[in-house]
């Protein structure tokens, strides 16, 4: 995805813009948006970006708030690209088992698992 | 999801069973399975479990290898439950922005981002 700045810098800038525009964004006190109830964020990217779309449609555009939504759109593009890469390479069972073991290992150590 | 053991223990047991049965599982040298090319595993759960399904259909069942696939099926159920929880609570913008900030923060610090 051709972005002028690397994705990592894009994420940092977006966090800063989010803080800057928070007051403007929360002005709509009646709007309802799906909020995931757990911290395994990657599982919820679809809902997160749907929520961003709802928020954008209700926010007066212009200035750097437009930049915020542009950035979020580029982040979405990056994530969509990552999702595409989930199934692009078909490899031997050995490689798949390595990945599965890694996935379960990450789940074991890093996921917030409710009992 | 009613499982006899907590999900965290289930994951640990599954990792052990995966090591135990690795030789049996890699016996099929011609089989090709999609393997994600990045380490943001949570984005690829669909493909991972599709791959598990392919592997299961090609593996002679019986004994503890059956237990391995049963466990993996329970882990899938857990993840499906977590995915459902992504959109169940529609809250105010304030709560959504908290979650978005958290998501971007995790992306900033924990994701493996390719430039």
């Amino acid at each position: 995805i051709p972005t002028e700045i690397p994705t990592s810098a894009l994420v940092k800038e977006t966090l800063a813009l989010l803080s800057t525009h928070r007051t403007l964004l929360i002005a709509n006190e009646t709007l309802r948006i799906p909020v995931p109830v757990h911290k395994n964020h990657q599982l919820c990217t679809e809902e997160i970006f749907q929520g961003i779309g709802t928020l954008e449609s209700q926010t007066v555009q212009g200035g750097t708030v437009e930049r915020l939504f542009k950035n979020l759109s580029l982040i979405k593009k990056y994530i969509d690209g990552q999702k595409k890469k989930c199934g692009e390479e078909r490899r031997r069972v050995n490689q798949f088992l390595d990945y599965l073991q890694e996935f379960l290992g990450v789940m074991n150590t890093e996921w917030i698992i409710e009992s | 999801i009613p499982t006899e053991i907590p999900t965290s223990a289930l994951v640990k047991e599954t990792l052990a069973l995966l090591s135990t049965h690795r030789t049996l599982l890699i016996a099929n040298e011609t089989l090709r399975i999609p393997v994600p090319v990045h380490k943001n595993h949570q984005l690829c759960t669909e493909e991972i479990f599709q791959g598990i399904g392919t592997l299961e259909s090609q593996t002679v069942q019986g004994g503890t290898v059956e237990r391995l696939f049963k466990n993996l099926s329970l882990i899938k159920k857990y993840i499906d439950g977590q995915k459902k929880k992504c959109g169940e609570e529609r809250r105010r913008v304030n709560q959504f922005l908290d979650y978005l900030q958290e998501f971007l923060g995790v992306m900033n610090t924990e994701w493996i981002i390719e430039s």
């Epitope: 009646t30 309802r32 779309g53 449609s57 | 105010r92």
Partner: antibody, heavy 111, light 105 residues
């Protein structure tokens, strides 16, 4: 509660059965005599709360998952708080769906 | 408002919202319909503007999109005597309509 004097507080407990408060949200709705329904607030399955802004300063909702109980507290009661108070269950879904309602608790605010 | 109909007749009641209850992202309309019989708590009939709650007779149908919604009872029965409320599920607070009282002639 029955009859309560103005400026006092109201506390109502809604005890549920057949489902878990960790999976289902619970809403509170009231209905003044001979009038329509007014949504008061909700406690989500996750424990978060949202209130009708018209009552926000006087209303609080909490729960005890282990006892399957949801609590409504309304402070500084006024005569126009006289109503039937209902708790209602909202299943896990992105759509609001108050599929089971309690029989209601009558409150009369009068001096 | 109130409506008076004979048993067996078709009846439609409307609910108008001051703002759109349609989410353009997922094309869902966030509106529910309830029936309240005298001396009873409300009962859910329709959610998501058109999805009938399980156990609700198929003579009840919800339709509409955006700001205009309709509840239709295809053939009114004596037991349908009640007040019918719509409820906004799009934004806070989840306001109810003022209700339509259905009388059976």
């Amino acid at each position: 509660p029955g009859l309560v004097a103005p400026s006092q507080s109201l506390s109502i407990t809604c005890t549920v059965s057949g489902f878990s408060l960790t999976s289902y949200s619970v809403h509170w709705v009231r209905q003044p005599p001979g009038k329509g329904l007014e949504w008061l607030g909700v406690i989500w399955a996750s424990g978060g709360t949202d209130y009708n802004s018209a009552l926000m300063s006087r209303l609080s909702i909490s729960k005890d998952n282990s006892k399957s109980q949801v609590f409504l507290k309304l402070n500084s009661l006024r005569t126009d708080d006289t109503a039937m108070y209902y708790c209602a269950r909202d299943p896990p879904s992105s759509l609001l769906r108050l599929d089971y309602w309690g029989q209601g608790t009558t409150l009369t605010v009068s001096s | 408002s109130s409506l008076s109909v004979s048993a067996g007749e078709k009846v439609t009641m409307s609910c108008k919202s001051s703002q759109s209850l349609l989410n353009s992202g997922n094309q869902k309309n966030y509106l529910a319909w309830y029936q309240q019989k005298p001396g009873q708590p409300p009962k859910l009939l329709i959610y998501g503007a058109s999805t009938r709650e399980s156990g609700v007779p198929d003579r009840f149908t919800g339709s509409g999109s955006g700001t205009d919604f309709t509840l239709t009872i295809s053939s009114v029965q004596a037991e349908d005597l009640a007040v019918y409320y719509c409820q906004n599920d799009h934004s806070f607070p989840f306001t109810f309509g003022s209700g339509t009282e259905l009388e059976i002639k």
